[in-house]
């Protein structure tokens, strides 16, 4: 019972975590204009992994996609990659863990197979969570070290560099969403790994009685027949999941030019 609860809870926590990682990756507010000690301006700038936005006091929001790959900083590309890898691994982990859930019966799947799959999904969740935490942390570090470039032209203005009133950026909501989501995915993965140990059939000692036809004495032989734990080469695990996950639908697509909200 405790194993099922641990596995179910691990699954739910990971599901929430991965949803959070997807949300954070899609969010525009990775960095937001630092309003502290700045002149009061009638525009508010914020930037995400995929586009930068400007919200005007009058009520209009204009977002511009980063229509370049080569022009973007390597760090931004790295953060994108980490988040996408986290989403892909998390999505695969979720798919695997659905089949691994003890409460779901799929044919005559053995507990050993379920234990294997639980462990696999747990490891995937852990790596997914670490990827998200790493991605968010790299971006946060980039913000701290730059306090966002004196030119304020990091990857929005690819054209001429115009000296402007310096716009400084600070941590956006997406960073906190990403950290929490990554942490939840990590915790969910650990819970799945713990549940895996409970799912694996334990070592059982069967008392073997040996009868000797010639003699009258009966000898009891404490012999051990090891039950398969599911991790050895003798397991009858079938390949349940192929491991190919698509990411196109995981990240929302953005308008091609200007998006006025």
């Amino acid at each position: 019972m405790a194993v099922t609860a641990c596995q179910g809870l691990g699954f739910v926590v990971s599901l929430i975590g991965i949803a959070g990682i997807i949300a954070a990756t899609c969010m525009d507010q990775w960095s937001t204009q630092d309003l502290y000690n700045n002149p009061v301006t009638a525009v508010f700038n914020y930037q995400g992994l995929w586009r930068s936005c400007v919200r005007e006091s009058s009520g209009f929001t204009e977002c511009r996609g980063y229509f370049t790959l080569l022009g973007l900083p390597a760090m931004l590309q790295a953060v994108r990659a980490l988040m996408i890898v986290g989403i892909v691994l998390g999505a695969i982990g979720l798919l695997v863990s659905i089949f691994a859930l003890k409460c779901i019966r799929i044919g005559s799947m053995e507990d050993s197979a379920k234990a294997n799959m639980t462990l696999t999904s747990g490891i995937m969740f852990i790596v997914s969570g670490l990827c998200a935490i790493a991605g968010v942390s790299v971006f946060a570090n980039m913000l701290v070290t730059n306090f966002w470039m004196s030119t304020a032209n990091m990857y929005t203005g690819m054209g001429g560099m115009v000296q402007t009133v310096q716009t400084r950026y600070t941590f956006g909501a997406a960073l906190f969403v990403g950290w929490v989501a990554g942490g939840l995915t990590l915790i969910g993965g650990v819970m799945m790994c713990i549940a895996c140990r409970g799912l694996a059939p334990e070592e059982t000692n069967y008392k073997a009685v040996s009868y000797h036809a010639s003699g009258h004495s009966v000898a009891y032989k404490p012999g051990g027949f090891k039950a398969s734990t599911g991790f050895g080469s003798n397991t009858k695990n079938k390949k349940i999941y192929d491991g190919g996950a698509r990411t196109e639908d995981e990240v929302q697509s953005y308008p091609s030019k200007h998006d006025y909200v």
Epitope: P39, V43, Q47, C53, S57, S58, T156, G159, V162
Partner: antibody, heavy 117, light 113 residues
Amino acid sequence: QVQLKESGPGLVAPSETLSITCTVSGFSLTTYGVQWVRQPPGKGLEWLGAIWAGGNTNYNSALMSRLTISKDNSKSQVSLKMSSLTAADTAIYYCAKGGYGNAMDYWGQGTLVTVSS
Amino acid sequence: DIVMTQSPSSLAVSLGERVTMNCKSSQSLLNSGNQKNYLTWYQQKPGQPPKLLIYWASTRESGVPDRFTGSGSGTDFTLTISSVQAEDLAVYYCQNDYFFPFTFGSGTKLEIK
């Protein structure tokens, strides 16, 4: 279509409080901001302040202590209150809708306020 | 507060002539986030409320004739009327729409010779 109409008292005594209401139609105050501008006779434009969609306000720093801008979204009305009036506050008072670039794309016809005893 | 300085204060031109008026701000009105200048031009004819001509320093408001062109960046801006018409007789104001409080220039009065 978008319309703004100011309604004011016309004549106000010095040291009294001016109250002007701007009634809007054709757009929602929950989506767009409204700004106030005044123009003394024969002079230039002076920005008084604004109330934005979210309800936050900004004021002309020279008039901040005397100005209050508020709104009633359900009635589609924005009100401007200015206390301690003097003859220098005699002007045409305009309300205008905020547009792209924080510019004022639609204006009311204005209401003339004369401060005199 | 941002100071907006307009020059000249008045202009007398002939119909069909090209006219240029300037506006200078005490601080850059360029927003780095979208590389747009928050400078607006208004036209005010006698007895009427101001009318929006140009926003973002160079974007014409819909319905504004294309003889009106806004240009400039940072602190220096220009409004050009390529061929002055009789109906262009008005006072033209520039406005800072970037820093609070928003501020207007003193205006340029366009008169017909």
